[in-house]
């Protein structure tokens, strides 16, 4: 497959990935499958740095990030590790909260006004960011 | 100038296979998802499925799920429906369209006519 | 599946008319709809996105509004070659799903 070097058009490049911001809402695996379909996934938060990067561009609006735990255990949509990486989630969350009345808890991960995360019902729509690094070989299966 | 240009329709027996092609040009093609929507004579607009620039990720209507496979060839710019199992209801014009940002079809090719018949 | 409903069905007007086509989601799709015009034999062209947002080369008589649910497109002033018929897509979620259309003929 060919490699990116550059980002496409309306995508902002940071650190050596290339990060595109709604401007409306979706639901989470709407926004998910939004992602896929640009050959990225819903953003990674590896960093505080990152954070702040993101955090600068969405401003205090409630935005779904690549981090979900509707099987289980939390997991990263790219499968960095969640145990092991960098949190952000306001006090006392995630909390999986039932009191919505929706149905169910909480399963995904949004950036709330101030930029820290709170997980919250997945068919909410938010806003999200998709992420795609450079340089990695695209996904482009083999011709038969 | 862009342009989208289907071909390879035609009538087939019911079970039986075709495979649609869609030449682009104009654009880049390779950084742009592109779907498949089909029209049967005298109805409206049914979205068929959808392919990423790589073609790493597809989705399909309930309707031709696990009988359609889409697929791509960035180094010939062509995008290609495979249509197995077809049926009588599978019959209409076929086009290929460009996705846009706001996830709707910004450029349409002139449609292929499949007609599936015994 | 999200299912999507116009009205009217058909709608006759006079050149320098104003028209207004109004489009219903079965569920909120915010502001993800988009409008074509599609002439007999012809493939659709997308006239507009997002809702409202006018496509390059479209006339600026075509204008769209709505969020949520229900959504309007609106011709300031009919043309002869406006006669054609107005279709909205739902591009909230897969799967895409299309109106039935609206039919504008001459009266």
């Known amino acids: 497959g060919s490699e990116r070097t550059c980002c496409p058009v309306n995508w902002v490049e940071h650190e050596r990935s290339c990060y595109w911001f709604s401007r409306s809402g979706k639901a989470w695996a709407d926004a998910d499958n939004y992602c896929r379909l640009e050959d990225a996934h819903l953003v990674v938060v590896t960093s505080w740095e990152e954070q702040k990067f993101v955090q600068h561009h969405i401003g205090p609006v409630n935005t779904w990030m690549g981090l979900h735990d509707q099987n289980g255990p939390w997991k990263w949509v790219d499968g960095t590790d969640y145990e092991t990486g960098f949190k952000n989630w306001r006090p006392e969350q995630p909390d999986d909260w039932y009191g919505h009345g929706l149905g169910g808890g909480e399963d995904c991960a949004h950036f709330t006004d101030d930029g820290r995360w709170n997980d919250d019902v997945c068919q909410r729509p938010y806003r999200w960011v998709c992420e795609t690094e450079l340089d990695k070989a695209s996904q482009e299966p083999p011709l038969l | 100038e862009v342009q989208l240009l289907e071909s390879g329709g035609g009538l087939v027996q019911p079970g039986g296979s075709l495979r649609l092609s869609c030449a682009a040009s104009g654009f880049t093609f390779s950084s742009n998802a592109m779907s498949w929507v089909r029209q049967a004579p005298g109805k409206g607009l049914e979205w068929v499925s959808v392919i990423s620039g790589s073609g790493g990720s597809t989705y399909y209507a309930d309707s031709v799920k696990g009988r359609f496979t889409i697929s791509r060839d960035n180094s010939k710019n062509t995008l290609y429906l495979q249509m197995n199992s077809l049926r009588a209801e599978d019959t209409a014009l076929y086009y290929c369209?460009?996705?846009?940002?706001?996830?709707?079809?910004?450029?349409w090719g002139q449609g292929t006519m499949v007609t599936v018949s015994s | 599946d999200i299912q999507m409903t116009q009205s009217p069905s058909s709608v006759s007007a006079s050149v320098g008319d104003r028209v207004t086509i109004t489009c219903r989601a079965s569920q909120n799709i915010t502001t993800w709809l988009a409008w074509y015009q599609q002439k007999p034999g012809k493939a659709p062209k997308l006239l507009i996105s997002?809702?409202?947002s006018l496509q390059s080369g479209v006339p600026s008589r075509f204008s769209g509004s709505g969020s949520g649910t229900d959504f309007t497109l609106t011709i300031s002033s009919l043309q002869p070659e406006d006669f054609a018929t107005y279709i909205c897509?739902?591009?909230?979620?897969?799967?895409?799903?299309f109106g039935p259309g609206t039919k504008l003929d001459i009266k």
């Open positions: 369209a460009k996705r846009n940002y706001d996830d709707a079809f910004d450029i």
């Open positions: 997002a809702a409202s």
């Open positions: 897509q739902q591009a909230n979620s897969f799967p895409f799903t």
